[in-house]
Amino acid sequence: AVNGTSQFTCFYNSRANISCVWSQDGALQDTSCQVHAWPDRRRWNQTCELLPVSQASWACNLILGAPDSQKLTTVDIVTLRVLCREGVRWRVMAIQDFKPFENLRLMAPISLQVVHVETHRCNISWEISQASHYFERHLEFEARTLSPGHTWEEAPLLTLKQKQEWICLETLTPDTQYEFQVRVKPLQGEFTTWSPWSQPLAFRTKPAALGKDT
């Protein structure tokens, strides 16, 4: 696709995973492609096989080591290549000099739990997963609450501009089912983006006490 449009986008999860998506207009679904990673200052290199995720889009994960191992630093540069099989040879389709800490996308927060729930408020906590110690406290969060009769897209975003792994939701309706999600983003990196949303946490507020003014 010489005149078509292609896109090669990769993100580092800050520990031991680089996730990549390669898309190309007009490419055949059964095309066999790989991503090769060559760091500039490490002894290892890594390959993953791109697998189709849509009509003209492929994805794979470069697993660099144990999930919590710190495989790259802010000074590392990894040359990433997309290679696709053409007959008997591999053809380089795309090359990127990848700066891991300029292209961050963390794993979704995990272990969401209700710490305390009342009629009108609920305190929820969570944990971050596989996040580098380099960030120290330089992280921010976004949270959203799904109310009955609404969609996630309609839910207002609550922004936490610091590393705060809990939230107190207020002005809730008694005896009502809600769902809650949170995502995380490092402050570092020109091309850094939000993590995926966490798995939703379902909770129900306490009913109002009978005979009490609510």
């Epitope: 010489v2 005149n3 449009t5 292609s6 190309q24 290549r81 389709m93 795309a94 990127q96 000099d97």
Partner: nanobody, 123 residues
Framework: QVQLVESGGGLVQAGGSLRLSCAAA????????VGWFRRAPGKEREFVAA????????LYADSVKGRFTISRDNAKNTVYLQMSSLKPEDTALYYC????????????????WGQGTQVTVSS
């Protein structure tokens, strides 16, 4: 925003050599790798070669492999296309273009373009 200015084009005999230059300016230029494209009279614009700033990784069109060499001088923010063993079919307007992070052979993947420099190869 990235600005690109080509130079070095001209008239040359078949079998001769030329070196084109592409001076790049703009914010964080190392995030914008550079490619050379060409448009011959009455033809579509086609990919020639591309290079990344940091590792110096390169891509070439099959038609120029072994004859053309792309290189860069990071200190001068300049990319060069050394053209040897030139043929009349290399006659074209040569453009340099900057991509967003990734080099490919697709012209639609390049976001910033220079005005071009003319190369004419006589037989």
């Amino acid at each position: 925003q990235v600005q690109l200015v080509e130079s070095g084009g001209g008239l040359v005999q078949a079998g001769g050599s030329l070196r084109l230059s592409c001076a790049a300016a703009g914010r964080a230029i190392e995030n914008y790798p550079v490619g050379w494209f060409r448009r011959a009279p009455g033809k579509e614009r086609e990919f020639v070669a591309a290079i990344t700033w940091i590792s110096g990784s390169t891509l070439y069109a099959d038609s120029v492999k072994g004859r053309f060499t792309i290189s860069r001088d990071n200190a001068k923010n300049t990319v060069y296309l050394q053209m040897s063993s030139l043929k009349p079919e290399d006659t074209a307007l040569y453009y340099c273009a900057a991509a967003l992070k990734t080099i490919t052979r697709g012209q639609n993947d390049y976001s910033y373009w220079g005005q071009g420099t003319q190369v004419t190869v006589s037989s």
